[in-house]
């Protein structure tokens, strides 16, 4: 009696169980009663990453430099090429099909986490006691200057965008 289901890494065709082609190979011809499944390796710019019965291999992804992409990991006959972004850019999606510039943290905000090829800059507000006076993708909030450790006094209070201004202590007149 012809089978209705096949083992793992097999497929049913013409009431017969044929072996699937291994990753990195495509199907040329199905098996018969007398012959095995015929498979052929994918060409250099192609891949198949599963046991399959595909008659065509998939093209490797192209990391388009015009979109700010570069190759992070070259594809093989069994794996696709992995793209990432050029320095100063990060992917717009998980599949990394295009890149955008890293965001800068505005004055009053500092960098909490520096951007990578796959994630944007994470900014945080400078809390009381800290400031950032620049727009930057790298600068963190800095603590206000401690006037008293320099034997000075605060002449102008700090904000989240400006440091305190220190000055000499007022000398008591005799």
């Amino acid at each position: 009696e012809p089978p209705t289901a096949c083992r793992e890494k097999q497929y049913l065709i013409n009431s017969q169980c044929c072996s699937l082609c291994q990753p990195g190979q495509k199907l040329v011809s199905d098996c018969t009663e007398f012959t095995e499944t015929e498979c052929l390796p994918c060409s250099e710019s192609e891949f198949l990453d599963t046991w399959n019965r595909e008659t065509r291999c998939h093209q490797h992804k192209y990391c388009d430099p015009n979109l700010g992409l570069r190759v992070q990991q070259k594809g093989t006959s069994e794996t696709d090429t992995i793209c990432t972004c050029e320095e100063g850019l990060h992917c717009t999606s998980e599949s990394c099909e295009s890149c955008v510039p890293h965001r800068s943290c505005l004055p009053g905000f500092g960098v909490k986490q520096i951007a990578t090829g796959v994630s944007d800059t994470i900014c945080e507000p400078c809390p009381v006691g800290f400031f950032s006076n620049v727009s930057s993708a790298f600068e963190k909030c800095r603590p206000w200057t401690s006037c008293e450790t320099k034997d000075l006094v605060v002449q102008q209070a700090g904000t989240n965008k400006t440091d305190v201004v220190c000055g000499p202590q007022d000398r008591q007149r005799a």
């Epitope: 945080e124 809390p127 006691g129 800290f130 603590p143 206000w144 200057t145 450790t149």
Partner: antibody, heavy 116, light 111 residues
């Protein structure tokens, strides 16, 4: 990746002073703010103070102003906390921790035991 | 100094259920659209691990079952569904002003 490596456990006598170190790696030391935190009997966390490695500026919790002195050595990317006139109340785990709002990276902690 | 009061001090929750931890500040820690409250997890013999910053933002690498909410003086950490590995002590901390202060901690036990 930011890593903070602290000096090992210490057993000291009451009245003595001691210095804990915290060596930073994986980032530009001068750009980050180093905090120190005390944890007594495995529970209560207390912020001791912070130091700006860029210029050595410090800010202390008033409670620890006469107890702790914070310094840095930029050349070795190391922060130090010296604890003065130790008593049994100072027995605790001390952490260095980097951050401005929350403390995103912590050292492994240094256990200090003050016992006569 | 701002005093942070956590409740409950300990909590036992069934695997897969929700754990809710509260943190109340003695004065508002919110200003200019930001709430300067943060949460940590600490397991015995380990350093505190940051979970949530600025009330509701997940630190990178922290599972989405952790969430934070609140503003002004009242803040909440939720864990749902709770997993075995979540057994730990949880702390809140503010950065509204210096000195920074921490809550007294909430010990979470998984049943």
């Amino acid at each position: 990746e930011v890593q903070l490596q602290q000096s090992g456990p210490e057993l000291v006598k009451p009245g003595a002073s001691m210095k804990i170190s915290c060596k930073a790696s994986g980032y530009s030391f001068a750009d980050y703010t180093m905090n120190w935190v005390k944890q007594s009997h495995g529970k209560k966390l207390e912020w001791i103070g912070l130091i700006n490695p860029y210029n050595g500026g410090t800010s202390y919790n008033q409670k620890f102003k006469d107890k702790a002195t914070l310094t840095v050595d930029k050349s070795s990317s190391t922060a130090y906390m010296e604890l003065l006139s130790l008593t049994t109340e100072d027995s605790a785990v001390y952490y260095c921790a980097e951050g401005v709002n929350n403390f995103a990276d912590w050292g492994q902690g240094t256990t200090l035991t003050v016992s006569g | 100094d701002i005093v942070l009061t956590q409740s409950p001090t300990s909590l036992a929750v069934f695997l897969g259920q929700r754990a809710t931890i509260s943190c109340r500040a003695s004065k508002s820690v919110s200003t200019s659209g930001y709430s300067y409250m943060h949460w940590y997890q600490q397991k015995p013999g380990q350093s505190p691990k940051p979970l949530i910053y600025l009330a509701s933002n997940l630190e990178s690498g922290v599972p989405a079952r952790f969430s934070g909410s609140g503003s002004g003086t009242d803040f909440t950490l939720n864990i749902h569904p709770v997993e075995e590995e979540d057994a730990a002590t949880y702390y809140c901390q503010h950065s509204r002003e210096l000195p920074r202060t921490f809550g007294g901690g909430t010990k979470l036990e998984i049943k």
